[in-house]
Interface confidence: low
């Protein structure tokens, strides 16, 4: 259905009206209710195309959850039954590297990606004859593209002979998975704001269907990188926005990830949360953090969904989610994707192809262990996919899922035909499963990553590692020179070393004051409206990071602009990554950095460290033999026992799993 105030063809410069035909082996016939697999004949620009569709069984489930709120703000949890949904993926017969994401709920609606063009299709409103409009995505009116992509000609294989049997869906999708050999799973959570909900006529079903459609489109784009999108939850702010959306895109993104960390993660585990907003930000279609997909505090993005189609909007969400997955903008780099603009072009709209640069950026993220949370195949109670043995997702009622019969031949633990464990097996997958057996309790499964982190161990009765926890925010680190913040000890020298190499260190305070008082791209305290904010003297240590003793120039897949400012006998070095207005700047001082006695940086301001809500008296609570973790439980030193570290034991916490195994004392940390 068209959105209120949005005429069906007003956004198109050109379109055709067609009548698709459902195809059976015997004859063409008028459409009938949807099924697991279906084929249609459609016409586009004088040509007939046969499209083969298969229900996207990995997308949604038995246990799909939608969160909404009543008038008084009470959370309502709904499990709509949409197992036999009408969202499909597929390909165009005889067209190499084509892909399709369509819904067949009330007519055909979706995207067809051919070699040289992408088409949108949707039912013609008020037609009783199954008429549809079909249009090139290039013919959708949008802001002029800012495109700096260098498109190399891609050698094209000749199309298969049309008489040849079409490839199976599995073969087709395998053929497209050329980037990384191991499938990654993004557990995506979508949040829809109040204004967008109002714009959809306050119809929760319509919002839900639109977001499922969106997830199907995203899956069809990401599959080329061997990434699957699994929609693990939807929240609609039916009663009012739960964050302040006043201010610039950066403010709203900051508010959203703070809300996510405080309220959403505890309710539903996920890898990335994307906020869908109606409100625009003066030409900024969205904003997201780069490379933060597995971060507790920053794995999110915001996306503006105003008067555009869901097909066009899908490329915006694909772009912002791409940032979370480590992808930088393509502009100014030698990138190609076989189209005139790629998803990660800073101004692209309606693109569906990821570029070679995006693939490389994502590969870098995985090599640097920034994508470890993408390896887990969603658990049955977290993945919303219609249960199906053989889809490599462990669905409700399954104990394991090794995939196709051929893949299952290589799996020693899982019975491929039933998706049950083999008789001798305790487990088939997970960090605490080895050779079909649970690893013994006390086996380290997630090591300590910094002085502000704590290790986790297998518990001996589960294939999964204990949930990740770290030292409580606000605990002193680096010999009292810094505070722990989200598992990292945040201090200036370490940040300088990440950017400028191991010998770099923080510049003197005067550097920060001098440079950050300017309010330009090299020295500022954030962005407000269309201009950089000057730092007040008291906030200068929370603006652009200033370093000295620089001997290496950073390379992060993109070449940043570097500025050197002489100040009182030293050179202050700063950096502008020029990532664009939709990406927070990694050249700024990190949140949680100690900017004075009892003070930390937050939102480019030097504020009282009490905002971290650190409330752990380690002497009283942990008897001086431990620290508090992010669940506010004691993590005891080796030699002392949880929960309060007052009796002898082997360290750890109630959250970490046992640190000791009676059978093997060598397993202790």
């Amino acid at each position: 259905a068209a959105r209120p105030g949005f005429q069906q063809t007003s956004h198109l410069s050109s379109y055709e009206i067609i009548t698709p035909w459902r195809l059976t082996r015997e004859r063409r016939e008028a459409p009938r209710p949807y099924s697991k697999q279906v084929s249609y004949v459609i016409q586009a620009e004088g040509k007939e195309h046969i499209i083969h569709l298969e229900r996207n069984k990995d997308l949604l489930p038995e246990d799909f959850v939608v969160y909404t709120y009543n008038k008084e703000g009470t959370l309502i949890t709904d499990h709509p039954n949409i197992q036999n949904h009408c969202h499909y993926r597929g390909y165009v017969e005889g067209v190499h590297n084509s892909s399709i994401a369509l819904s067949d709920c009330f007519g055909l609606r979706g995207l067809l990606h051919l070699e040289n063009a992408s088409y949108g299709i949707e039912p013609l409103q008020n037609s009783s004859h199954f008429e549809h409009i079909i249009y090139r995505m290039d013919d959708v009116y949008k802001e002029p593209l800012k495109c700096g992509v260098s498109n190399k000609d891609i050698e094209k294989e000749t199309a298969k002979d049309e008489e040849e049997e079409p490839p199976s869906m599995t073969q087709l999708l395998r053929r497209r998975r050329a980037v990384l050999p191991q499938t990654r799973y993004v557990e995506l959570f979508i949040v829809v704001d109040k204004e967008r909900y109002d714009m959809m006529g306050r119809n929760q079903t319509a919002v839900r269907e639109e977001m499922i459609l969106l997830a199907n489109y995203l899956d069809s784009m990401y599959i080329m990188l061997n990434i699957r999108i699994v929609l693990v939850g939807l929240e609609i702010w039916t009663n009012g926005n739960l964050i302040n959306i006043v201010g610039g895109a950066g403010d709203v993104l900051g508010n959203f990830v703070q809300w996510r960390e405080k309220f959403l993660i505890t309710r539903r585990r996920h890898d990335s949360a994307q906020l869908v907003l109606k409100k625009g930000f003066g030409g900024t279609a969205g904003m997201a953090f780069v490379g933060t997909v597995c971060s507790r505090s920053h794995a999110g993005g915001i996306n503006v969904f105003g008067q555009i189609t869901v097909e066009t909007f899908a490329s915006i969400v694909a772009h912002e989610l791409g940032h979370n997955l480590g992808m930088n903008h393509d502009d100014g780099r030698d990138c190609s994707c076989g189209a005139k603009s790629c998803i990660m072009n800073s101004g692209a709209s309606g693109s569906r192809n990821f570029s070679s640069c995006s693939a490389e950026d994502f590969e870098k993220l995985t090599l640097n262990k920034g994508g470890n949370c993408l390896l887990n195949i969603p658990k049955p109670d977290e993945a919303y996919s219609a249960p199906s043995c053989g889809n490599k997702l462990v669905d409700a009622g399954e104990e394991c899922d090794c995939g196709t019969p051929k893949e299952c031949e290589l799996d020693p633990c899982c019975e491929g035909s039933t998706c049950k464990l083999k008789s001798f097996a305790e487990c088939a997958y997970g960090d605490c499963c080895k050779d079909c057996r649970f690893l013994p309790g006390g086996t380290l499964c997630r090591g300590k990553t910094s002085e502000c982190d704590v290790p986790e161990y297998c518990n001996g009765s589960s294939q999964f590692c204990q949930p990740d926890v770290f030292i409580q925010n606000g605990y002193p680190c680096q010999n009292n020179k810094a505070y722990c913040y989200n598992g990292m000890c945040q201090y200036y020298d370490a940040q300088c070393q990440v950017i400028f190499g191991s010998k770099a260190k923080a510049a003197p305070k005067d550097c920060f004051i001098e440079v950050n008082s300017k309010g330009d791209r090299f020295g500022n305290c954030g962005f407000s409206g269309n201009e950089y904010k000057k730092c007040a003297t008291g906030n200068a240590l929370c603006g652009k990071l200033q370093c000295e003793n620089v001997q290496e120039i950073p390379v992060f897949g993109i070449v940043p602009a570097i500025i050197q400012t002489p100040s009182r006998g030293t050179k202050c070095w700063g950096v502008d990554f020029q990532l664009g207005s939709d990406v927070p700047d990694p050249g700024m001082v990190n949140e949680g950095t100690k900017c004075g006695a009892g003070k930390i940086c937050r939102n480019f301001q030097c504020v009282d460290a009490s905002v971290l809500n650190y409330d752990c008296d380690v002497q009283k609570k942990c008897h001086g033999h431990g620290v508090c973790n992010s669940n506010k439980n004691c993590h005891c030193e080796n030699g002392w026992a949880p929960p309060n570290c007052e009796t002898k034991g082997y360290g750890g916490s109630v959250d970490s799993g046992p640190t000791y195994n009676e059978m093997n004392t060598a397993l202790r940390d």
């Epitope: 709120y69 009663n239 926005n241 964050i243 302040n244």
Partner: nanobody, 125 residues
Framework: EVQLVESGGGLVQAGDSLRLSCAPS????????VGWFRQAPGKEREFVAA????????AYAGSVKGRFTISRDNAKNTAFLQMNTLKPEDTAVYYC??????????????????WGQGTQVTVSS
């Protein structure tokens, strides 16, 4: 754009009472949860009391519980803060704020989109 106007502040003796009012210009107060916050010189702004849009839920900071009462009269398009047994430590600028967000975040100033200019309350001993 909703603008909030506070009134009723002033200078009183310890143990006295005051009634603050909050009225919106350009909006209907029944559409919003209303909160009162205060800021003493050199201190952070702190939550005082809040009332939900329907008036069925109220919440108070521990330091004012039992002494202050928040209420609303939607017919008069006004919210009130009745302050009894005032103490010197109640001295501050009192701000009225309105929120369209979920009421469970009543004590977090980030969730209030609309704010008044504030009214000074001074309690002498």
């Amino acid at each position: 754009e909703v603008q909030l106007v506070e009134s009723g502040g002033g200078l009183v003796q310890a143990g006295d009472s005051l009634r603050l009012s909050c009225a919106p210009s350009g909006g209907i107060i029944s559409n919003y949860h209303v909160g009162w916050f205060r800021q003493a010189p050199g201190k952070e702004r702190e939550f005082v009391a809040a009332i939900s849009a329907s008036g069925t839920s109220t919440a108070y900071a521990g330091s004012v519980k039992g002494r202050f009462t928040i209420s609303r009269d939607n017919a008069k398009n006004t919210a009130f803060l009745q302050m009894n047994t005032l103490k010197p430590e109640d001295t501050a600028v009192y701000y009225c704020a309105a929120s369209e967000y979920v009421f469970r975040y009543y004590d977090d100033s980030r969730y209030y989109a609309y704010w008044g200019q504030g009214t000074q309350v001074t309690v002498s001993s």
